[in-house]
């Protein structure tokens, strides 16, 4: 070896100075008599060697780097050989920190593999290889005497967690625990921890399961949960309270926390939910009152609560057949009475014959809004009711009466915009309890089975706003039926738009007669449409080849016009237009020419 | 220092009833499961029941599963054995103990003799 | 339900022996094992727990070990007041079950 590194120190701070030295030996001066030392850090030529030839005749160079501030590079001692850079010796230079206190150490007691599980922070990087070290000794007291030292715990490569096995362990006693690290540069310790590890022990939560349902238990009721838990086997006798969680499957709703709930409560009813829903649950526990950790939460629960029973009214409205007096139709609408009402599966409407206790004989069952059934000849009373899997509403009796009430009068109904009626009436004396309002496509088309309806429960209302399934352009029959305390009064009926369309067409103009100076016109009137207002008015309009325009005006039930006046041998273009409430429209141009004035008139 | 002391042991005659009661003291009696171990003559230790710290939770040994029942006055510092339908077998020294969270016996009571004979 | 097996039953040493005893578990237990000590007309004692844990009190010459199903417990220089019979115990369950019992008597 022809040259050789000396360095005050291969490791050193971050950006501290470094001295080193590179003696060459006097067997090497064939290379050079006076070889130049020269220094190169990693890939770079460091200038500032100081060079001398010592007394045995030895080269030595000596450099000082003011700053290291690679955490590791490769100093070299070279010389020129040739073109070439020639190597002598190279050492490697590593520059970091002395490692920090570590920090947050805290451990966790672990029934489930015995163990005591230590974790902590090990602070910035110190860029140089640290170790770690869990240390920890057993303690009668509060840690300030030191009993036998217990086996130091050594993580694996990168790890900032430990773990002390069961054999090195002393349950209900305290221990002092605390982390060494050290490298090249130093040593540091983090705060001493002094714990049981009985007091630090994290529980697993128990297994939530759902109630098997018992024959003699009662049913959840509507909006409640029933469900157990299976505690955990290693803390079957470790005294633990648990909390739960639950939320709505469905939405964003948060976690709504229920708690605290001793563990060996083992089963529990879970109410104030909402009815026919399904939630998410979780448990969790910790030990107590001794000291613990929570332990997670567990795996989710699923379950669905009950419904309840529709709480509903039913607003009610039948009809007879005229054919068939005993066959009635019968409408209904559930009005919520509670913000929850239930959900509603279907409807049934059934009879008890007098005499017959007990016997309800269903007429129809449905998940309409109405049905059909035939009348027994000595019914005058049905019972509708709105039932799910919970139940039923409460009955709604429907009696079916003759009416014998006081007609209401004055019944108007005028549009309010395209796709609402407004219907009046002067209300009867006495007042009604309410009102029936029906309404449906006037003829042609009307119909009994699509009339749409509404009740009214003010006696002293005078008018309703018909919103519903009413379109602009359709001829509506509004019918209203004052009722009674157990009678109803005659229907009224009127009709109306809720807003017409102008006329589609206007008559098609003919020819009849025509002579030197007038024209006989005549058309046939479009048939009345549906929907399309009456015709107010006719105005006729005629133009001659100067561009002048003529018009008359004359009433709809005109079916001709003679125009006078005309000029001789002369063009005009004639057309009609057709008005009514709802707008215009023109019918095409007749083009005719009136005769010479030596010609004969034509008729 | 933790005391366990039993009472009511005694001769009884087969389907009969007798109730022992163990008084606690020197602990937070509130905080601990509770335990009943039997040990017939000249025979090794059987448990027979515990309970939890609140009651809610009361296993029984199969042997005497429907005829004991375990219960406890956390306000008096008392645990209970209600014991019915006595049979021959069941002649043994009753131990009240109390429980460690691990499940561990950690204090014993003396014992009192329940003998069932005719 | 779980069963505990002792063995042996009964044994004979002499003082400043090296006495083993072992209790195996019908399933696993974890670390869930205790040790009893009772002598003859008094009520037993709590030795170790949770395998390997030593009563307070308990000398050091007893030790526990084992985890799973298998349990031992070890006197390493068995002395003249520790000849009496021996229990171990299940705790892994609510229905907790003791082993038949090791009588440890004087050669």
């Known amino acids: 070896e022809c040259g050789h590194i000396s360095v005050s120190a291969p490791i050193v701070h971050l950006g501290d100075p470094i001295t080193a030295s590179c003696i060459i030996k006097q067997n090497c001066s064939h290379l050079d008599p006076e070889p130049q030392i020269l220094w190169r850090l990693g890939a770079e030529l460091q200038p500032g060697g100081r060079q001398q030839r010592l007394s045995d005749g030895t080269q030595e160079s000596i450099i000082t780097l003011p700053h290291l501030n690679h955490t590791q590079a490769f100093l070299s001692c070279c010389l020129n050989w040739g073109n070439s850079l020639q190597i002598l010796d190279q050492v490697e230079l590593r520059a970091g920190y002395p490692p920090a206190i570590p920090h947050n150490l805290s451990c966790l007691m672990n029934l489930t593999t015995s163990s005591l599980i230590c974790q902590w922070e090990p602070g910035p990087e110190t860029h140089l290889p640290t170790s770690f070290t869990l240390k920890s000794f057993k303690s009668r007291g509060n840690c300030q005497t030191q009993g036998d030292s217990i086996l130091d715990c050594v993580p694996k490569d990168g790890q900032s967690h430990c773990c002390i096995p069961r054999k090195h362990l002393l349950l209900y006693q305290n221990m002092g625990i605390w982390v060494q690290a050290e490298n090249a540069l130093g040593t540091s310790m983090s705060p001493q921890l002094c714990l049981d590890p009985m007091d630090v022990v994290k529980l697993e939560p128990p297994m939530l399961r759902t109630m098997d349902p018992s024959p003699e238990a009662a049913p959840p009721q509507a909006g409640c949960l029933q469900l157990c838990w299976e505690p955990w086997q290693p803390g079957l006798h470790i005294n633990q309270k648990c909390e739960l969680r639950h939320k709505p499957q469905r939405g964003e709703a948060s976690w709504a926390l229920v708690g605290p709930l001793p563990l060996e409560a083992l089963q529990y009813e879970l109410c104030g939910l909402l009815p026919a829903t399904a939630y998410t649950l979780q448990i969790r526990c910790i030990r107590w009152p001794l000291p613990g950790h929570w332990s997670d939460w567990s795996p989710s629960l699923e379950l669905r609560t009950t419904e309840r029973a529709p709480t509903v009214r039913l607003d009610t409205w039948w009809r007879q057949r005229q054919l068939d007096p005993r066959t009635v139709q019968l409408f209904w609408k559930p009005v919520p009475l509670e913000e929850d009402s239930g959900r509603i599966q279907g409807y049934v409407v059934s009879w008890r014959p007098s005499g017959q206790a007990g016997a309800i004989l269903p007429l129809c069952n449905t998940t309409e809004l109405s049905c059909t059934f035939h009348l027994p000849s000595e019914a005058q009373e049905v019972a509708l009711v709105a039932y799910n899997s919970a139940g039923t509403s409460r009955p709604t009796p429907v009696v079916f009466s003759e009416s014998r009430g006081p007609a209401l009068t004055r019944l108007h109904a005028m549009a309010r915009d395209p796709h609402s009626l407004w219907v009046g009436w002067e209300p009867p004396n006495p007042w009604p309890q309410g009102y029936v309002i029906e309404w449906g496509l006037g003829p042609p088309s009307a119909s009994n089975s699509n009339k749409t309806w509404r009740m009214e429960q003010n006696g002293r209302a005078t008018g309703f706003l018909l919103k519903e399934n009413i379109r602009p352009f359709q001829l509506y029959e509004i019918i209203v039926t004052p009722l009674y305390q157990d009678t109803m009064g005659p229907s009224q009926h009127v009709y109306a738009y809720s807003q017409e369309m102008a006329p589609s067409h206007a008559p098609e103009l003919h020819l009849k007669h025509i002579g030197k100076t007038w024209a006989q016109l005549e058309w046939v009137p479009e048939p009345p449409e549906l929907g399309k207002s009456p015709l107010t008015h006719y105005t006729i309009f005629w133009t001659n080849a100067q561009n002048q325009s003529f018009s008359a005006i004359l009433n709809a039930s005109s079916r001709g016009f003679v125009l006078h006046g005309l000029e001789p041998a002369s063009l005009y273009h004639i057309h009609l237009m057709a008005a009514s409430q709802a707008g215009a429209t023109n019918s095409t141009v007749l083009t005719l020419m009136t005769l010479t004035p030596e010609g004969s008139e034509l008729h | 220092e933790v005391q366990l002391l039993e009472s009511g042991g005694g001769l009884v005659q087969p389907g009969g009833s007798l109730r022992l009661s163990c008084a606690a003291s020197g602990f937070t009696f509130s905080l601990y499961w509770m335990g009943w171990v039997r040990q017939a003559p000249g025979k090794g230790l059987e448990w027979v029941s515990s309970?939890?710290?609140?009651?809610?939770?009361?296993p029984y040994a199969d042997s005497v599963k429907g005829r004991f029942t375990i219960s406890r006055d956390n306000s008096k510092n008392t645990l209970y054995l209600q014991m019915n339908s006595l049979r021959a077998e069941d002649t043994a020294v009753y131990y009240c103990a109390k429980l460690g969270e691990l499940g561990m016996y950690m204090n014993w009571g003396q014992g009192t003799l329940v003998t069932v004979s005719s | 339900d779980i069963q505990m097996t002792q063995s042996p039953s009964s044994l004979s040493a002499s003082v400043g022996d090296r006495v083993t005893i072992t209790c195996r578990a019908s399933q696993g237990i974890s670390s869930y094992l205790n040790w009893y000590q009772q002598k003859p007309g008094k009520a037993p004692k709590l030795l170790i727990y949770?395998?390997?844990n030593l009563q307070n009190g308990v000398p050091s010459r007893f030790s526990g070990s084992g985890s799973g199903t298998d349990f031992t417990l070890t006197i390493s220089s068995l002395q003249p007041e520790d000849f009496a019979t021996y229990y171990c115990?299940?705790?892994?369950?609510?229905?907790?079950?003791f082993g038949g019992g090791t009588k440890v008597e004087i050669k």
């Open positions: 949770y395998a390997s």
């Open positions: 309970i939890s710290s609140s009651g809610g939770v009361t």
């Open positions: 115990q299940q705790s892994w369950t609510y229905g907790q079950t």
